[in-house]
């Protein structure tokens, strides 16, 4: 039975050209996290964090995506096209798969609000 829950940063906003941290946290389960996948709104893969082999950043994003902190992901040099949904998928044993959702809104610098507690200034 899957007892865990995913907590995420929820809806966040960040400045165009800036950076933001996407963070998910799995709680209420003793399951072993074998891998965390980060996907973009069009379901393209951004990065993988495998428990045994570490971080793998999809080649197309290697200049704009940095691993961490922890199992989170840092997006850099944000553009307006980065606005949209992001998903963290926790692959665990024996529970199975947990999935969390974050909505990122990239704002023009003049109107950006610092609404995310995980946001990098």
């Amino acid at each position: 039975m899957m007892t865990g829950t995913i907590e995420t940063t929820g809806n966040i906003s960040a400045k165009k050209g800036g950076s933001v941290i996407l963070q998910c946290h799995l709680s209420s389960t003793m399951a072993q996290v074998t891998q965390v996948n980060w996907e973009q709104h069009d379901h393209s893969l951004l990065a993988i964090r495998n428990a045994e082999l570490g971080w793998h950043i999809y080649p197309a994003f290697k200049d704009r995506v940095a691993p961490g902190p922890g199992l989170g992901l840092t997006l850099q040099s944000l553009t307006m096209n980065d606005t949209g949904e992001y998903f963290c998928t926790y692959h665990t044993y024996p529970d199975g798969t947990y999935r969390g959702r974050i909505f990122l809104e990239v704002l023009e610098s003049s109107v950006a609000e610092h609404s995310a507690r995980f946001q990098i200034p």
């Epitope: 074998t34 996948n37 379901h43 893969l45 495998n50 045994e52 082999l53 570490g54 793998h56």
Partner: antibody, heavy 121, light 108 residues
Framework: QVQLVQSGAEVKKPGASVKVSCKAS????????MHWVRQAPGQGLEWMGI????????SYARKFQGRVTMTRDTSTSTVYMELSSLRSEDTAVYYC??????????????WGQGTMVTVSS | EIVMTQSPATLSVSPGERATLSCRAS??????LAWYQQKPGQAPRLLIY???TRATGIPARFSGSGSGTEFTLTISSLQSEDFAVYYC??????????FGGGTKVEIK
């Protein structure tokens, strides 16, 4: 040209161990993951595990954990797969296969010729 | 683990005809899917990676499509050397990386 050359066929008794080698040539050995895949007679392909030849990091299929050990010798560009406590069901052709660069998991573009391991009393 | 399901198990096709092979993943693998061809007594050979990109030296009659959970390998006009077993594989979640059970393409 890029190639993987495996060691020869083996006949083992139940309970014994077998160590299969896979020598790589024609490319930068530490830069690509190496996988081991087996195929029982008349059956499909079964992934056993992966090794990062640069760091020696490994990840094994749960089914084989505790029985399989993958190692590498960078000086000879060779990877090894040792399977212990052999049983008749381990009778199979064992393949090494080159995966993607160690920065990203990729498909298996180069395969060894296979090593037949027969377990029989 | 991600379960890969191939259909049909066996496909009987006449030379020159089109063959369509299907592969379904139990959860999204994005485009991280490969197709392999295996002939009796030989090691598998990579045909398609990234769901739709042909590997080096693979003829244009082989094409791959799909993303997420549904994928297709199409052989536009079967040649005699194409009769073999075909496997799909996801390479995005491990352990374990998983293969489908295979589709045998045989002469009708």
């Amino acid at each position: 040209q890029v190639q993987l050359v495996q060691s020869g066929a083996e006949v083992k008794k139940p309970g014994a161990s077998v160590k299969v080698s896979c020598k790589a040539s024609g490319y930068t050995f530490p830069a690509y993951y190496m996988h081991w895949v087996r195929q029982a007679p008349g059956q499909g392909l079964e992934w056993m595990g992966i090794i990062n030849p640069s760091l020696g990091l490994t990840s094994y299929a749960r089914k084989f954990q505790g029985r399989v050990t993958m190692t590498r010798d960078t000086s000879t560009s060779t990877v090894y797969m040792e399977l212990s406590s052999l049983r008749s069901e381990d009778t199979a052709v064992y393949y090494c296969a080159r995966g993607g660069r160690t920065t990203w998991i990729g498909a298996f573009d180069i395969w060894g010729q296979g090593t037949m391991v027969t377990v029989s009393s | 683990e991600i379960v890969m399901t191939q259909s049909p198990a066996t496909l009987s096709v006449s030379p020159g005809e089109r063959a369509t092979l299907s592969c379904r993943a139990s959860q999204s693998v994005s485009s991280n899917l490969a197709w392999y061809q295996q002939k009796p007594g030989q090691a598998p050979r990579l045909l398609i990676y990234g769901a739709s990109t042909r590997a080096t030296g693979i003829p244009a009659r082989f094409s791959g499509s799909g993303s997420g959970t549904e994928f297709t390998l199409t052989i536009s006009s079967l040649q005699s050397e194409d009769f073999a077993v075909y496997y799909c594989q996801q390479y995005v979640v491990w352990p374990p990386l998983t293969f489908g059970g295979g589709t045998k393409v045989e002469i009708k």
